[in-house]
């Protein structure tokens, strides 16, 4: 007697009736009614049996508008997932003020989540359909492979970056000096070599270590995930202790906020210039703007009081430009790279990740270039016969000249993914022979030779006012790092949400499924297992959307925005205007 | 071609017993868990009993420690002891392979394939 399929209901919409159908209260039912000893009572099903056979139905007993309905969303759910991390693929490509160590992690995880898009929710939605597997046993172990590596290597890449966060924020003076793209990429690789190992070889030769296949035709599963304690193990270390990690490593970054908010209210709340000083030189660990970390931890006291005034520190690679950077002006990717001054330190949030070949700290004073009157250079001998008035604007800074050679440096500003709109000034440090009397050693001729000559009292009174004006900004630009970090707070609290959101349903069911064999119907199932692959269609979301570059190089890319000019014109408009004017009618301060 | 052939129904007295066999063809039966449904006229189909890959067995309350499921790998049958029969278990029998570990041991639909069916028919 020839046998006939019954999976005629969908496998996603239980409620829809064709032959072989449940009742809708079939799929809902509770777990908590499952007896002593196993038995089960159960609710009765709807009876109106037919004798096709839709094993071999390529719409697997499901109606044509079900069929359309399941493809068209999750069509759209892959095309987005493909289009989105695609995007980001291509912007870190094509934009190389996107090329910090951040973002590689942001580029792996992205292969990883659009492995998925393009291979996994494919391949699972025809399953679904058909619902059963037609490729045959290679393709089922091979996708399943695909499928567990991908998703593995995504959950890894998230763990990766809640670690590079969590120690970018927490340890900045030892972590950050080791934080290069060649670690990065052994991170990287190790969340792929972990992936592959843990499933790749598990997957694909189990059947032959075990001597038989058990996956029965049509059906395509992991073999050696037929036991349900070994599904659960599998779980634990792919979900359970990754979302545990995770959470702690958040938490603690947000209580460091917290604490630093704190630390703040506390600046704030005082003026003093003792208490200016240990703000711009704080003993606990932060991160690397807002601490203004030294390269050396050891330097002298009186180096300390003499830059304790107002500086900041800036991550760079050199101030010099090389023949490469002469050379962006010509080339066809100039306009990705918004190298000057303003806008190298603009770049957007992805700031925090900057890896340096030969990553230094210093600090570097801006040259003021005024009219009539010779560059100043780490001077505090300041020309007296004009004065200089500061605008509204932020003070002690100067935005550099226009066509001054570019410039690459990046600020070790907070945390990346957040869109916080980044500063566009570049500070001034003041050398402050005020109250001292006297400088310390520095490698600058032009200090050695004017830094010790007497200050006029206007010039004394100009000094104190931009030491008083400046500590000010400081902790406006401690308060404006905070706010990023919040905002980075924010995104990795997004991100983790996200994470739990879509992975939790999918891991309960096996986590269910170990104490209660059978019990979860196949479309509960199918439902977790998808929830699971929009983790990898938020993913772009979460962090590149979170990201002011990533942004701004998805709408060039999106509205095919190829003209130099507009672009240049975009980046121009971003720059702000110079703070320091001279002012020609004479005025006593 | 896989083919699920159920046998041993027929007419009882209510308290009387008996043993349906389902004897599968096409498919390896110790890759598949088995289930057991009915069918009364004129009312909706039950889950009766099912097994699992892993040995464990669920019966529906009713039939609880009346009925039980049971199989024979090696002769590629499942079968399902009814003792203590009642006049309610008349109905038209089914067995069903479930192929997914992924799936319910009463959900119908979750079940790869059936058999067509054999009557019991309990008189009082």
């Known amino acids: 007697m020839t046998l006939h399929s019954n999976s005629t209901t969908s496998p996603l919409f239980p409620n829809i009736s064709s032959s072989w159908v449940h009742s809708p209260s079939e799929a809902g039912l509770p777990l908590g009614t499952v007896t002593q000893l196993g038995s089960y009572n159960i609710s009765q099903e709807t009876g109106n049996f037919s004798s096709n056979d839709t094993s071999s139905d390529p719409l697997g007993g499901h109606t044509i508008w079900q069929v359309v309905f399941i493809a068209f969303l999750t069509g759209f759910l892959a095309l987005v997932t493909i289009i989105g991390n695609i995007l980001v693929i291509v912007a870190f490509k094509v934009n190389k003020q996107l090329k910090t160590v951040n973002n590689y992690f942001l580029l792996s995880l992205a292969c990883a989540d659009l492995i998925i898009g393009v291979i996994s929710m494919n391949l699972f939605t025809t399953y679904i359909i058909m619902n059963r597997w037609a490729l045959g046993n290679l393709a089922c172990d091979l996708w399943l492979s695909i499928d567990y590596v991908a998703s593995n290597a995504s959950v890894m890449n998230l763990l990766v970056i809640s670690f590079d966060r969590y120690f970018s924020i927490t340890r900045p003076l030892t972590y950050r000096a080791k934080r290069t793209t060649k670690r990065a990429g052994v991170m990287i690789g190790l969340a792929w070599v972990i992936s592959f190992v843990l499933w790749a070889p598990a997957i694909l030769f189990w059947q032959y270590f075990v001597g038989k296949r058990t996956v029965p035709p049509g059906e395509c599963f992991i073999q050696f995930l037929s036991e349900p304690t070994i599904t659960f193990g599998t779980a634990i270390a792919a979900f359970y202790m990754p979302v545990t990690i995770m959470t702690i490593l958040y938490w603690r970054i947000y209580k460091e906020t917290e604490k630093r908010t704190k630390e703040l209210a506390g600046l704030q709340a005082s003026g003093t210039e003792a208490e200016a000083e240990n703000f711009v030189h704080p003993t606990g660990s932060s991160r690397s703007c807002s601490s203004y970390e030294l390269q050396q931890q050891g330097v002298k006291r009186s180096s300390r009081r003499k830059y304790g005034r107002c500086h900041f520190w800036f991550t760079t690679k050199s101030w010099k430009p090389s023949a490469e950077q002469m050379d962006q002006d010509h080339s066809s990717s100039d306009s990705w790279n918004n190298n000057d001054a303003a806008a190298s330190l603009e770049n957007s949030a992805s700031s925090d990740e900057e890896d340096i070949g030969s990553e230094t700290r210093a600090i570097y004073s801006i040259v003021l270039k005024l009219p009539g009157h010779s560059s100043i250079l780490n001077s505090t001998k300041l020309p007296s016969s004009d004065n200089l008035q500061v605008s509204n604007e932020d003070l002690g800074t100067v935005d550099v000249e226009r066509n001054a050679h570019k410039l690459q440096a990046q600020k070790s500003m907070g945390d990346g993914d957040n869109c916080q709109k980044d500063f566009t000034k570049l500070p001034i440090q003041l050398e402050s022979a005020v109250d001292t009397g006297k400088t310390s050693d520095t490698n600058s001729s032009a200090d050695k030779t004017t830094a010790t000559l007497p200050l006029s009292f206007k010039e004394a009174t100009l000094a104190k006012r931009f030491a008083l004006k400046t500590r000010s900004q400081i902790t406006k630009r401690k308060r404006m790092s905070l706010i990023k970090e919040k905002k980075a707070a924010q995104t990795l609290s997004a991100i983790l949400l996200a994470f739990i959101i879509t992975w939790t349903p999918y891991n309960i069911m096996v986590l269910v499924n170990t104490f209660c064999d059978s019990c979860i119907p196949k479309t509960y199932w199918n439902l977790g297992y998808w929830l699971c692959y929009i983790n990898s269609t938020v993913n772009p979301v979460c962090y590149a959307l979170c990201n002011k570059t990533f942004r701004t190089t998805f709408k060039t890319l999106l509205l095919c925005q190829c003209d130099k000019r507009k672009r240049r014109k975009q980046q121009y408009q971003q720059r702000q205007s110079v703070i320091f004017h001279k002012r020609v009618p004479e005025q006593a301060l | 071609q896989v083919q699920l052939q159920e046998s041993g129904g027929g007419l009882v007295q209510a308290g009387g017993s008996l043993r349906l066999s389902c004897t599968a063809s096409?498919?390896?039966?110790?890759?598949?868990?088995m289930g057991w449904f009915r069918q009364a006229p004129g009312k909706e189909r039950e889950f009766v009993a099912a097994?699992?890959?892993?040995?464990?067995?669920y019966h529906q309350d009713s039939v609880k420690g009346r009925f039980t499921i049971s199989r024979d790998n090696a002769k590629n049958t499942v079968y399902l002891q009814m003792n203590y029969l009642k006049p309610e278990d008349t109905a038209v029998y089914y067995c069903?392979?479930?192929?997914?570990?992924?799936?319910?041991?009463?959900?119908?639909?979750?079940?790869?394939?059936r058999g067509q069916g054999t009557q019991v028919t309990v008189s009082s």
């Open positions: 096409g498919l390896t039966l110790s890759n598949y868990a």
């Open positions: 069903a392979a479930r192929g997914s570990r992924r799936s319910a041991y009463y959900s119908s639909s979750d079940y790869t394939y």
């Open positions: 097994d699992t890959w892993n040995g464990n067995t």
